[in-house]
Interface confidence: medium
Amino acid sequence: KSPVFGPQEVSSVEGNSVSIKCYYPPTSVNRHTRKYWCRKGASGRCITLVSSEGYVSSNYAGRANLTNFPENGTFVVNIAQLSRDDSGHYKCGLGINSRGLSFDVSLEVSQGPELPNGTEVYTVDVGRTVTIKCPFKTENAPKTKALYKKIGQTSVLVIDSRNYVNPNYKDRIRLRIPGTGQLIFTVVIDRLRLSDHGLYLCQAGDGSNRDEKNADLQVLEPEPELVYEDLRGSVTFHCALGLEVANVAKFLCRVNSRETCDVVINTLGKRDSAFEGRILLNPQDKDGSFSVVITGLRKEDEGRYLCGAHSDGQLQEGWPIQAWQLFVNEESTIPRSPTVVKGVAGGSVAVLCPYNPKESQSLKYWCLWEGAQNGRCPLLVESQGLVQEQYEGRLSLLQEPGNGTFTVILNQLTTQDAGFYWCLTNGDTRWRTTVEIKIIEGEPNLKVPGNVTAVLGETLNIPCHFPCKFSSYEKYWCKWSNTGCQTLPSQDEGPSEAFVNCDENSRLVSLTLNPVTRADEGWYWCGVKQGHFYGETAAVYVAVEEKKVAGSRYVSPAKADAAPDEKVLDSGVREIENKAIQDPRLFAEEKVVADTGDQAGGSRASVDSSSSEEQGGSSK
């Protein structure tokens, strides 16, 4: 399907002008290539009428032009002094007329209606309000005032000053007669319907002295605004329906093949399941305007959308509406990224979020979509740091890998973390994307002890076990803070042959803090990565306390919650006052605690990666 998009049907009246906007993917080639407007002939050939290279056919001379807007990926064809002869089938396109990079447009120019002399024309959108003004002479001031609608040769009474109201206009029409001295009465019709379209006659008095005034009421369906968005991107529909419906329920619906409109979302809490996790209805402003955001655009989201207001939260005739025609461009600049990311309870996920690479300096954000009522997306983390306290120690946003992608890591997963999350920036809003996190059965691949208590001034060693499948990955430890996770200096991992024949159950990367200081308290993450692409992580909290008994050197979990399956740490644990204290001999082997003396090189924090076998610890 061609990525060029424009209005399918354009209609106008003789003598008027039209402006036709066509959209194209704003690639470098497309921006600079020829743009054209051509008319399809009986033979199927399309004869150029106007092009971006300055050509204008003789038929269009002096009344048409084509303007390219390369920065927006649009071009506009303006045609003035329309005649009935201009009705026909056209194409707006790029490159060569026959190449297929084009969009079919039907132009219909009709003859203007034959109106009686002195007819006032009122042009109003469906659902809006019209005020018809009816002048009269002084002698008709006390006489009956009325408004008729002309249907063929007959006139049907609509309203009069004797309190008659035609049933078709019930509860939406009123006749106002001003005070003395003002020789004009008005008829106000609210919530206009398409069927209200037509010629009306105001009348004051009767007989040969009566005052008459013709009014032509043109009720228009709102012209859909064309919206051209990229696949996987985001669209915002801004809906401003006016103060008169500020307190009425609002909705967005999509027109179906039966020409009815299916509710996508409304303020009464209804939402189409096809948009679960990727739609928000923004709260109304005081003027009653609101907006609807849809992310993760799919080809099947294409179509005609209407927003409106009605107490039922769905489309009803005679209520104000706004319309859009959405085209989803499959030649998307937004890269593919997983829409579902799976993690296990206790494990972690690393989510890749795309952003516009031209906006590398923009702030990056991650929020949790909440479906209640109109939906909301409270911010969890941003590129400047964590925002929600309850995610302390387990959430971080990284600028890596960069160049159009950032990473969000969430660990210590629970079933409550399942849901939809949005990636966004404070730049190009079209690059908002949605990812669903699913929690599945399984065990975390990385195993660390439960929370650990370290002793001030001594050496702390924390093991992180990883399976063979991660042997080729880069292993790291980092200290979490609310602005990121600072990688700790890594010791040389020794000969690479250590991982070549990976027949053991797991391998080990150890974090050493030597000597432990008060500043070492906090969350530490063990993780694996490949280049700038992050994999799984595991978190451990290190509490720091004063030395309790002279000469004792132990590490104990702050809470007795050693990691499940942490069988290596299970042996040699004895209960003392409900606090698990591991046997120091075990740690000497397991490299959880070493001597208080400085390590080689005297490093404060270091990471050592080796196999369990080399450590002499029991394997799983």
């Epitope: 985001s234 923004n282 955001v293 997306c377 911010l379 925002v387 306290e389 404070n426």
Partner: nanobody, 120 residues
Framework: EVQLVESGGGLVKAEGSLRLSCVAS????????MGWYRQAPGKERELVAR???????HYAESVEGRFTISRDNAKNTVHLQMNGLKPEDTAAYYC??????????????WGQGTLVTVSS
């Protein structure tokens, strides 16, 4: 639209203290992140301290331990308590608010700034 008005700047001797305040024209309860930034003559604007709606704070390394940021949602105000001031803290201090709409759109608002001069 959020208007931010800073106050509390002035001339102070080294090792002295100042308390900057930033009052927002609207409720700051819905403002996700508020922060103080500074710009010394001929230098780029830099972060001093920020505080999230969840109460999480973050400080530039150069001010850690000397400056404290706090927010008073009831008074729509953010404070920056500056102790142990140094001549290198001399700059125009700006208040910034990031308003995060549920649409995912973020609007950033800046105050006009207040001047802090630390003499040696």
């Amino acid at each position: 639209e959020v208007q931010l008005v800073e106050s509390g700047g002035g001339l102070v001797k080294a090792e002295g203290s100042l308390r900057l305040s930033c009052v927002a024209s609207t409720s700051i309860a819905s403002i996700n992140v508020m922060g103080w930034y500074r710009q010394a003559p001929g230098k780029e604007r830099e972060l001093v301290a920020r505080i999230s709606g969840g109460g999480i704070t973050h400080y530039a390394e150069s001010v850690e331990g000397r400056f404290t940021i706090s927010r008073d949602n009831a008074k729509n105000t953010v404070h920056l308590q500056m102790n142990g001031l140094k001549p290198e803290d001399t700059a125009a201090y700006y208040c910034k608010a990031d308003v995060f709409a549920s649409s995912g759109h973020v609007t950033t608002y800046w105050g006009q700034g207040t001047l802090v001069t630390v003499s040696s």
